[in-house]
Amino acid sequence: KESCDVQLYIKRQSYHSIFAGDPFKLECPVKYCAHRPQVTWCKLNGTTCVKLEGRHTSWKQEKNLSFFILHFEPVLPSDNGSYRCSANFLSAIIESHSTTLYVTDVKSASERPSKDEMASR
């Protein structure tokens, strides 16, 4: 029988290369059993992770998977940086690894490559 501990599976040292002006969904895969934990997002500022208040977030359920999503509508140049999700479960705080958004400002990009071209960089 699987453990009923809450786990957050943001991949260690993961990153996403995205463009300012595009929509983007940052996913935090959340494993839990009966009771869905309270999950929040924060953005790293040095060694401190500043909780993101008033942002559009949502849950997605898909094929026995659960994701807590932070929506960027649209991505802004200031969204560049590292993010972490954390879960409050049985009065304990579980923190994910951080994931980094590399935002390209389309104003400074002379020619905009496709997302699939970006993947090969």
Epitope: Q7, L8, Y9, Y15, H16, S17, I18, P29, E62
Partner: antibody, heavy 118, light 111 residues
Framework: EVQLQESGPSLVKPSQTLSLTCSVT????????WNWIRKFPGNKLEYMGY???????YFNPSLKSRISITRNTSKNQYYLQLNSVTTEDTATYYC????????????WGHGTTLTVSS | DIVLTQSPASLAVSLGQRATISCRAS??????????MHWYQQKAGQPPKLLIY???NLESGIPARFSGSGSRTDFTLTINPVEADDVATYYC?????????FGGGTKLEIK
């Protein structure tokens, strides 16, 4: 059901570039992580790298200067390119999907056998 | 890189008996608060097949004769009782840290 199928040449000459395709059905490559692994004749398995749902990539540092992984989301395919191959790259190449909850490989292709020889 | 050392390299077990395969990691496998150690079975001419994920969870469709245990650096795959169909090479894999790595494999034969 999720299915993966590798395709590409079975024979490549030394110094040439190897190009393989992994065609995915039953899931979208815009979710999860999509990997390349190879198995050498001596049975050793080596992890090569992945392309993620967002298009970000990771390459094993042992291959970093020679490898690229790209994708075509409209075809639901992803690709391995390995430059400057040598006889040491003779292996069976597999593509596989990583599960979100722990990154284990829950679906694999059947594999394609590559020989590097002049 | 995290080195996974599997032992024994080969194993001959009588039908109905227990087979135990060990996998030792050069570093602790626990950065997700979870042991990201997995076990695969590979038969000749086939791709590896997932048996056990996250140290002790049985993959859907895999017989309960297979079990996994362990934490931190020491992990074990147990097959009990062994059947003729279990002849294969077994690999451990860690996905705790990039690059993911595999053990060298254990070849199981019937005595």
């Amino acid at each position: 059901e999720v299915q993966l199928q590798e395709s590409g040449p079975s024979l490549v000459k030394p110094s040439q570039t190897l190009s393989l395709t992994c065609s995915v059905t039953g899931d979208s490559i815009t979710s999860a992580y999509w990997n390349w692994i190879r198995k050498f004749p001596g049975n050793k398995l080596e992890y090569m790298g992945y392309i993620s749902y967002s298009g970000s990539t990771y390459f094993n540092p042992s291959l970093k200067s020679r490898i690229s992984i790209t994708r075509n989301t409209s075809k639901n395919q992803y690709y391995l390119q390995l430059n400057s191959v040598t006889t040491e790259d003779t292996a069976t190449y597999y593509c596989a999907r990583s599960h979100y909850y722990g990154y284990y490989f829950d679906y694999w292709g059947h594999g394609t056998t590559l020989t590097v020889s002049s | 890189d995290i080195v996974l050392t599997q032992s024994p390299a080969s194993l001959a077990v009588s039908l109905g008996q227990r087979a135990t395969i060990s996998c030792r990691a050069s570093e602790t496998i626990d950065s997700y608060g979870d042991s990201l150690m997995h076990w695969y079975q590979q038969k000749a001419g086939q791709p590896p097949k997932l048996l056990i994920y996250r140290a002790s969870n049985l993959e859907s469709g895999i017989p309960a004769r297979f079990s996994g245990s362990g934490s931190r650096t020491d992990f074990t795959l147990t097959i009990n009782p062994v059947e003729a169909d279990d002849v294969a090479t077994y690999y451990c894999q860690q996905t705790d840290e990039d690059p993911y790595t595999f053990g060298g494999g254990t070849k199981l034969e019937i005595k």
